[in-house]
């Protein structure tokens, strides 16, 4: 199996994490996609997901998380706005493809959120960085409960995150043929 790697972001409270997950266009364009947190000793837990089938360029908002799937470009944009210290933790994008196990998108994201006024537009009320005008058509998608038949033999890396999430969890294994690329933070 390919070694799992992490990309680390160190941000201040109030800023926005903004990443995009690239996927193989032909295979996964309309597949449902999800943003997950990996807590210490637990299986990945879904925080937000796109609709099924995933709609093109259609924002889905769950709390402070916004997902947008751009089919034509093969990428899922994930934003976590108005970051809080307790959002710190390990995250990943996955693609649902039942009955098979979800695909994980490289790389996992290690988010470190620290207290304090950052002095950047990310912490200002007037900033476009953390004040997103979500279209009125924004939807909340229901994330499926997906249990892998396999078990995890090793606990995921330690995470300090404690995030309020929907009641859906996903077990997944290591599929790492897809690349994740950072965008604006």
């Amino acid at each position: 199996a390919t070694k799992l790697t992490e990309e680390k972001y160190e941000l201040k409270e109030g800023q926005t994490l903004d990443v995009k997950c690239d996927y193989t266009l032909e295979k996964f364009a309309s597949s449902q996609k999800a943003w997950q947190i990996i807590r210490d000793g637990e299986m990945p837990k879904t925080l937000a997901c796109t609709e099924r089938p995933s709609k093109n360029s259609h924002p889905v908002q769950v709390g402070r998380i916004i997902l947008e799937d751009y089919h034509d470009h093969g990428l899922l944009r994930v934003r976590m706005v108005n970051l809080q210290v307790e959002d710190s933790g390990l995250y990943q994008c996955v693609i649902y493809q039942p009955p098979k196990e979800p695909h994980m998108l490289f790389d996992r994201i290690r988010l470190v959120v620290t207290k304090g006024f950052s002095g950047t537009p990310g912490s200002n009320e007037n900033s476009t960085q953390n004040v997103y005008k979500i279209p009125p058509t924004t939807t909340k998608a229901l994330c499926p409960l997906y249990t892998s038949p396999r078990t995890v033999t090793q606990a995921p890396p330690k995470s300090t995150a404690d995030v309020s999430t929907p009641d859906s969890e996903i077990n997944l294994t290591n599929v790492t043929d897809i690349i994740r690329v950072p965008v604006f933070n």
Partner: antibody, heavy 125, light 107 residues
């Protein structure tokens, strides 16, 4: 091979505006951050802001936020930087640069890897 | 904003010298740091990205190291074409910021 070609030199009066264009040829345009960086005479490089054409929402450095407007037109593969209320200290070379894109390494953000040739803007009365 | 402080601001060196430039971030930026070479009348050129990855086409005498707040650009054996100004730049968090530059001059 991606190339960024900028518009020509401009001479402007204080208080006026200038709009510099940056046209991409070759490669993908929509999913890259197109950044604008300037260098005033005798000064260092300064990041002004940038935009991902696909997403359309610009991000600005705080000191330029009130005066700069960055836009992009996907159909013509062109990014624009408009700076208003010009003053003499805005005299500088303005560069556009490609910010990042998909890659084959784990660190798939490549820095500002492709730059335009620069546009000299002179503000003088 | 994250402040990037380079040192020295200028240095004089001879061809063949080993040159080291440091860059310090005012807060942690993980490995999200790039180094650029800039010559008068030309566009800046990316040398190093992600703190230590060599950009395609850049000679191997250039190397980068560091993570968190302290970073280093090293030119193992200075060549005549290396005399220029060098900048570090962070892209861990918006707004991206550059160091003030280090001018490498001929001794």
């Amino acid at each position: 091979q991606v190339q960024l070609v900028q518009s020509g030199a401009e001479v402007k009066r204080p208080g006026s505006s200038v709009k510099v264009s940056c046209k991409a040829s070759g490669g993908t345009f929509s999913i890259y951050v197109i950044s604008w960086v300037r260098q005033a005479p005798g000064q260092g490089l300064e990041w002004m802001g940038g935009i991902i054409p696909l997403f359309g929402t610009p991000n600005y450095a705080q000191r330029f936020q009130d005066r700069v407007t960055i836009t992009a037109d996907e159909s013509t593969r062109t990014a624009y930087m408009e700076l208003s209320s010009l003053r003499s200290e805005d005299t500088a070379v303005y560069y556009c640069a490609r910010g990042h894109g998909p890659g084959s390494s784990h660190y798939s953000y490549y820095g500002l890897d492709v730059w335009g040739q620069g546009t000299t803007v002179t503000v003088s009365s | 904003d994250i402040q990037m402080t380079q040192s020295p601001t200028s240095l004089s060196a001879s061809v063949g010298d080993r040159v080291t430039i440091t860059c310090r971030a005012s807060q942690g930026i993980s490995s999200w740091l790039a180094w650029y070479q800039h010559k008068p009348g030309k566009a800046p050129k990316l040398l190093i990205y992600a703190a230590s990855s060599l950009q395609s086409g850049v000679p191997s005498r250039f190397s980068g190291s560091g993570s968190g707040t302290d970073f280093t650009l090293t030119i193992s054996s200075l060549q005549p074409e290396d005399f220029a100004t060098y900048y570090c730049q962070q892209y861990n968090s918006y707004p991206w910021t550059f160091g003030q530059g280090t001018k490498v001059e001929i001794k």
